[in-house]
């Protein structure tokens, strides 16, 4: 299964295109953007009505080695007097990236792209009621 | 670059670290997760800090389409209903990373390009109390 | 303790100019953002002109683009909105606020996550 015609435009393959082995693809892992500055956030984490903490994963064996992934602190949400109200539910907010994977086969070496889902932080959310008959 | 372990019976030769360059497989893994958020929940309608998604699409890129989130409003939605502007809606933004096709309109060249994308939204507590 | 004190508001013919000041005080504009937001009867509030000190980035609604300017001087811990070409649709009650939304990407506006409000100033537009 290879990557669709990207938003189904039907690409003029330019003659500087570098030659690419059937079944793969080329790809340059030095990241454009990569020194984008990123400001300290303001603590949204622990301000949030549904608060979260962050846990670092990290896999010699994927670019980038570290994914941070976040986990709501709670089921319900925090209300004004600071106490959790379980009437409404802190859920996970999640996004997808690219990772490369690389993987050894005996003294080979192979690269795979792979989908990781991240989750981002959470949100404070009404829940659905499901009214038995 | 990042050290890779490797079995101790191999030749010295292999680099230990990522290359700049690699040849990757064209399957991508798990690639048919659901990209669509507005399919995949409705929390950005029943949130108390709702979004609107808004499609960015980019044919250099992939994934092409990419759902960008806006809070709704500058307070959040109260148990009647109603904005409070005690409170406020904050957007959640990740960095993630994607291809882009380099050189452009090549069909199977890229880089890997890191973004950063507004996910949806969460209430926050404003760190100093509003004037009365 | 933090005061944000809006002034400048009034009556004036679709067409006309206004010029809004908010002082603040216990508060300075270093590292921080400032703006300007109007919520009309009935309607939500809604954000019309921020700026952040940090790296001077400027937002301005859609609707207020070209007419409205948003300043500040620094020395008197004051920002302005200049309004022109006032348009019946801009009659609303007016507010200044601040807060560190300078956390967030220029494309994002620095209009979020505002700490401090002052009580608001009518402006009201008559066609």
């Known amino acids: 299964r290879k990557i669709p015609k990207v938003g189904h435009t039907f690409f003029q393959k330019p003659e500087s295109c570098p030659p690419v082995p059937g079944g793969s693809m080329k790809l340059d892992i030095g990241i454009i953007n990569e020194n984008q500055r990123v400001s300290m956030s303001r603590n949204i984490e622990s301000r949030s009505t549904s608060p979260w903490n962050y846990t670092v994963t990290w896999d010699p064996n994927r670019y980038p080695s570290e994914v941070v992934q976040a986990q709501c602190r709670n089921l319900g949400c925090i209300n004004a007097q600071g106490k959790e109200d379980i009437s409404m539910n802190s859920v996970p907010i999640q996004q997808e990236t690219l990772v490369v994977r690389r993987k050894h086969q005996g003294c080979s070496v192979s690269f795979q792209l792979e989908k990781v889902l991240v989750t981002v932080g959470c949100t404070c959310v009404t829940p659905v009621i499901h009214h038995v008959q | 670059g990042i050290t890779i372990p490797r079995n101790p019976g191999c030749p010295n030769s292999e680099d230990k670290n990522f290359p700049r360059t690699v040849m990757v497989n064209l399957n991508i893994h798990n690639r048919n997760t659901n990209t669509n958020p507005k399919r995949s929940s409705d929390y950005y309608n029943r949130s108390t800090s709702p979004w609107n998604l808004h499609r960015n699409e980019d044919p250099e890129r992939y994934p092409s389409v990419i759902w960008e989130a806006k809070c709704r409003h500058l307070g959040c939605i109260n148990a009647d209903g109603n904005v409070d502007y005690h409170m406020n809606s904050v957007p959640i933004q990740q960095e993630i990373l994607v291809l882009r096709r380099e050189p452009p309109h090549c069909p199977n060249s890229f880089r890997l390009e890191k973004i950063l994308v507004s996910v949806g939204c969460t209430c926050v507590t404003p760190i100093v109390h509003h004037v009365a | 303790e933090v005061q944000l004190v809006e002034s400048g508001g009034g009556l004036v013919q679709a067409g006309g100019s206004l010029r809004l000041s908010c002082a603040a005080s216990g508060f300075t504009f270093d590292d921080y953002a400032i703006g300007w937001f109007r919520q009309a009867p009935g309607k939500e509030r809604e954000a019309v002109s921020c700026?952040?000190?940090?790296?001077?980035?400027?937002y301005y609604a859609d609707s207020v683009k070209g007419r409205f300017t948003i300043s500040s001087d620094n020395a008197k811990n004051t920002v302005y909105l200049q309004m022109n070409s006032l348009k019946p649709e801009d009659t609303a009650v007016y507010y200044c606020?601040?807060?560190?939304?300078?956390?967030?990407?220029?494309?994002?506006?620095?209009?979020?996550?505002?700490?401090?409000w002052g009580k608001g100033t009518q402006v009201t537009v008559s066609s």
């Open positions: 700026f952040s000190s940090s790296d001077g980035s400027i």
């Open positions: 606020a601040g807060g560190g939304g300078s956390y967030y990407y220029t494309q994002l506006n620095y209009c979020y996550d505002m700490d401090y």
